[in-house]
Interface confidence: low
């Protein structure tokens, strides 16, 4: 059968028909609809939005749309005891207090239920003490403080600027350094781009703006009380003392007006170098404590937030496949927001809504995809990827047998400069081919392909004439699918120019000022970048669900495996004497990579030549492609991170947002020169090389001829 006959498709119902149906005007309308009130996880407003989306997806034509609910641990400020930070004098009087809320943006003054800035899952507490400025609170910042500057953070309250790494890693690092509290703030150096006005006159962060966010270190566990299993009606819940990933010290975020008041009085050591200075008119002294006249003053935190088991709701829509209904391609993004969610997540949710509408239109005209497409509106992403993780835990047996691919759909934009893609190497060729067929929305690239503008603006550091595609890290809902279950995953959005804009994320991230107007006035008035992202995400889903042979190229995995092996070997070779002493060899890993390369090459040749009209052989070849990502999963997981099971990629132990390659070996080598027992440390390096080599070889063998 031709592919048309196989899926009851008529020639006009191809990818072009799907893409042509996507409309910028609809995305704009949906974004407006999703951003008029807050949709905080666990609230009635977010439940109502879940029901609205369920109803609309049914109208659009999906076969079924269900709500999947879970009862998970969430965190909220205490309405009667607000969180704040004060400077106290020697008599204990509060001589300065940080603000209790952000000034609301114009037009939103009368909106109720705007949650004040807080660090989700902070324990309660009222610590007081001297302040230490710890820059970004990265691992290397604490090394600088403790090892080079001999500054002890034990018993101190640390103040750290947001940016560079996930806030949960900052808190973990502060805890390990012995701090008794953490203040997080947004420095204009990171959240105020030069030459741009602050909101509402531009897209920069005003001094009273604050970034909310969770400070967990879940390492992929999902609900802190039910790691590994769904938080359903009969769940056994851990006690709060045994909960996964909760911080042990109070944490609170502030804006740069309030930070100025704390930092301007800092004394003690000068900043070690210019990389520790932000853009405030303060000395950026490290401390500990305040200078001269203010040395008797202390900082006191007042944190009263509570952790509560709360019901959350995912929306799961199904478009059944005509030929392979038991093969799932998933498009998912979250619905919950910190406040209005103008960018995060609703710029993504609006795109998903339009993609569902387009697929539904085709379905109403008699078309079906070859494979089943699942659409998901996740809840409680902001509280630790909880909705997606609980659903995947509940459906793990189905997903590991049937999951072809997961495409993530959080914020569609974090800028309007060029495309940004992070994905498994299996999807590189799919992304390249798709973007070559799409038109660029960029000024100066009229009539040119998206591939061309993307490659020009964001070139690959390795291959000239190709665009940069990054490794998947975490901090979003693909985590459980990729890092735990080994389902090929990818994400795409429009981003800023990282060369000229060094600030972290986008300035108004997780603040009350992330509104519909922010997007409509400053980022994408024509919604052309949103449309392009819809075409990329939707196009990927279409190809993954509809192509006869799965659009995965295993040879691209071979190329990156060699690159990653070279990289980790060069890190290890910084210790040539120890490698000799402890007989550390990477031969097994390089041999496995070589075998993988050869087998992948042979598999690709067979893939070109096999009889695609034979459904058994076709299914067999597709299964080998589908299960390749799964083959990189180690059932035992990474050391101390059982839910990070992918041997090739994991979120960095130092920054959840970033991906690390050969993470087991990398972590074993990290700071190895400081380990108390070098013999044991190098033994662990050898063990991790063994695990990696075995896994690569085992994955290669899944691509060999089956008999």
């Amino acid at each position: 059968k031709s592919s048309n006959e196989a899926t009851n498709i008529t020639p006009k119902h191809n990818m072009k028909a799907f893409l042509d149906e996507l409309k910028a005007e609809n995305i704009k309308k949906f974004l407006y609809n999703f951003t008029q009130i807050p949709h905080l996880a666990g609230t009635e407003q977010n439940f109502q939005l879940a029901k609205q989306i369920q109803s609309q997806w049914k109208e659009f034509g999906l076969d079924s749309v269900e709500l999947a609910h879970y009862d998970v641990l969430l965190s909220y400020p205490n309405k009667t005891h607000p969180n704040y930070i004060s400077i106290i004098n020697e008599d204990g009087n509060e001589i300065f207090n940080t603000s209790l809320f952000e000034p609301p943006p114009p037009g939103y003054e009368n909106v109720s239920d705007i949650v004040p800035p807080f660090s989700a899952f902070s324990p309660q507490g009222m610590p007081e003490g001297d302040l230490v400025y710890v820059n970004y609170a990265r691992t290397e910042d604490f090394f600088k403080l403790e090892r080079d500057m001999k500054i002890n953070c034990s018993g101190k309250i640390v103040i750290a600027r947001y940016g560079k790494v996930f806030r949960g890693n900052k808190v973990k690092n502060a805890q390990l350094a012995g701090a008794k509290g953490v203040i997080l703030y947004s420095d204009p150096a990171d959240y105020f781009a030069p030459g741009v006005k602050s909101y509402p006159d531009g897209w920069n962060l005003p001094g009273g703006g604050v970034q909310r966010g969770n400070i967990l270190n879940l390492n992929g566990a999902g609900d802190p009380l039910t790691p590994g299993y769904p938080a359903n009606e009969y769940a056994y819940r851990r006690g709060i003392a045994e909960a996964v990933g909760l911080p042990s010290i109070p944490v609170h975020p502030i804006g740069y007006y309030d930070a100025q008041k704390l930092l301007e009085k800092m004394g003690g050591s000068a900043p070690p170098d210019s990389s520790w200075r932000g853009s405030l008119k303060v000395p950026y002294n490290v401390g500990p404590g305040f200078t001269g006249n203010f040395s008797t003053q202390k900082v006191k935190m007042h944190i009263h937030s509570t952790n509560e088991v709360t019901r959350i709701y995912n929306v799961i829509g199904t478009l059944r496949g005509a030929v392979e209904p038991d093969r799932y391609v998933i498009l998912g993004g979250h619905r919950d927001s910190w406040v209005f969610g103008g960018i995060d997540p609703q710029s993504g949710a609006a795109v998903v809504h339009e993609i569902v509408r387009s697929f539904g239109t085709l379905k109403k005209e008699g078309w079906r995809p070859r494979r089943t497409i699942l659409f998901a509106s996740w809840d409680a992403e902001e509280f630790g990827l909880l909705g997606s993780t609980e659903w995947a835990e509940e459906n793990s047996r189905l997903l590991q047998e049937r999951g072809v691919a997961y495409i993530n759909a959080d914020s569609s934009i974090e800028g309007n400069y060029t495309l940004r893609v992070d994905c498994t190497p299996l999807m590189y060729s799919l992304v390249h081919n798709l973007t070559k067929e799409l038109k660029s929305p960029d000024e100066g690239f009229e009539g040119k392909s998206l591939y061309e503008s993307w490659t020009k603006k964001s070139p690959s550091p390795e291959f000239s004439g190709m665009p940069r595609i990054s490794k998947l890290g975490s901090g979003n809902d693909f985590e459980v699918f990729f890092q735990r279950l080994g389902i090929a995953s990818g994400r795409a959005r429009y981003t800023k120019n990282w060369e000229t804009n060094k600030f972290s994320g986008y300035p108004l991230y997780h603040s009350v000022y992330e509104t519909y107007e922010l997007v409509e006035k400053f980022y994408d008035p024509m919604f052309k970048y949103h449309l392009t992202v819809a075409q990329v995400r939707g196009g990927m889903v279409f190809e993954l669900a509809n192509s006869i042979v799965l659009p995965f190229d295993c040879r691209d995995y071979a190329v990156v495996l060699r690159k990653y092996a070279d990289k980790i070997y060069s890190i290890s070779m910084k210790h040539p004497q120890e490698m000799k002493t402890y007989s550390v060899s990477f031969d097994s890993l390089f041999s496995a990579v070589k075998n993988f390369t050869e087998i992948a090459s042979k598999f690709s040749e067979r893939l070109q030549d096999f009889d695609k009209s034979n459904p058994i052989v076709l299914r067999m070849m597709n299964d080998q492609l589908m299960f390749l990502e799964r083959a990189f999963i180690d059932p035992l997981g990474l050391p101390d991170r059982p839910f990070y099971r992918h041997v090739i990629y994991a979120p960095s132990s130092h920054n959840k947002y970033a991906g690390e390659s050969f993470p087991g070996i990398y972590d074993a080598l990290f700071d190895i020169e400081s380990k108390v027992d070098p013999s044991k440390a190098w033994g662990e390096v050898k063990r991790q090389i063994y695990v990696a080599a075995f896994t690569v070889q085992a994955a290669a063998e899944t691509l060999s001829e089956v008999a």
Epitope: S2, S3, N4, N14, M15, K16, H432, N433, K436, E437, E462, F463, S464, G465, M466, N546, S547, I548, V549, R555, D556, A558, V559, R562, T597, E598, S601, K602, S604, E605, Q608, D609, D611, K612, S613
Partner: antibody
């Protein structure tokens, strides 16, 4: 046995047009991506372009030197791939080969001469 | 465009000799490299695909190796029918490109 047979070559004046055909047999033609490669007399091989299968939406890709002038198409019902050449230049003079994806099978070639 | 540079451009050898032809890519092309043999007046034939895999029916005296940017075609125990021109080519990215060819002549 896989067989590719090109036809349609000949002498044409600069600025003229020519359509080459490549008839395929011995394999499931509709599943395969097809390429055209050319070779000027005494010179090396130059890739001209590619057309993918229906499951890839018949996507086409071309060398810069022919982009906008040459068009590759296919008729799966006739097991044939075509190369429509417009605005021909003297430097397009070559033997044109049609090849199956990865260039693992080649036709015998057809000669195109562009001369006034 | 990725440039494939072959060396030498010609080599004189005798039956029974071992001949080595190298191909250098201007950028990393992984293992997406093929080797072709062409005799005068005929179409090229695929010898090696994926840098190191012999195509169906190709004698085992032909061996391909290499990855990333450096590739080698080795002909052991050269036979009379092996005197021809050999091309490398990459299909890693568009446009696909070929080396300029290496002519293996009778000494």
């Amino acid at each position: 046995e896989v067989k590719l047979v090109e036809s349609g070559g000949g002498l044409v004046q600069p600025g003229g047009s020519l359509k080459l055909s490549c008839a395929a047999s011995g394999f499931t033609f509709s599943n395969y991506w097809m390429n055209w490669v050319r070779q000027a007399s005494g010179k090396g091989l130059e890739w001209v372009g590619e057309i993918r299968s229906q499951s890839n939406n018949f996507a086409t890709h071309y060398a810069e030197s022919v982009k906008g002038r040459f068009t590759i198409s296919r008729d799966d019902s006739k097991n044939t791939v075509y190369l429509q050449m417009n605005s021909l230049r003297t430097e397009d003079t070559a033997v044109y080969y049609c090849t199956r994806r990865w260039n693992n099978f080649w036709g015998q070639g057809t000669t195109v001469t562009v001369s006034s | 465009n990725i440039v494939m540079t072959q060396s030498p451009s010609s080599v004189s050898a005798s039956v029974g000799d071992r001949v080595t032809i190298t191909c250098k890519a201007s950028e990393n092309v992984g293992t997406y490299v093929s080797w072709y043999q062409q005799k005068p007046g005929t179409a090229p034939k695929l010898l090696i695909y994926g840098a190191s895999n012999r195509f169906t029916g190709v004698p085992d005296r032909f061996t391909g190796s290499g990855s990333a940017t450096d590739f080698i075609l080795t002909i052991n125990n050269l036979q009379p029918e092996d005197f021809a021109t050999y091309y490398c080519g990459q299909s890693y990215t568009f446009p696909y490109t070929f080396g300029q060819g290496t002519k293996v002549e009778i000494k």
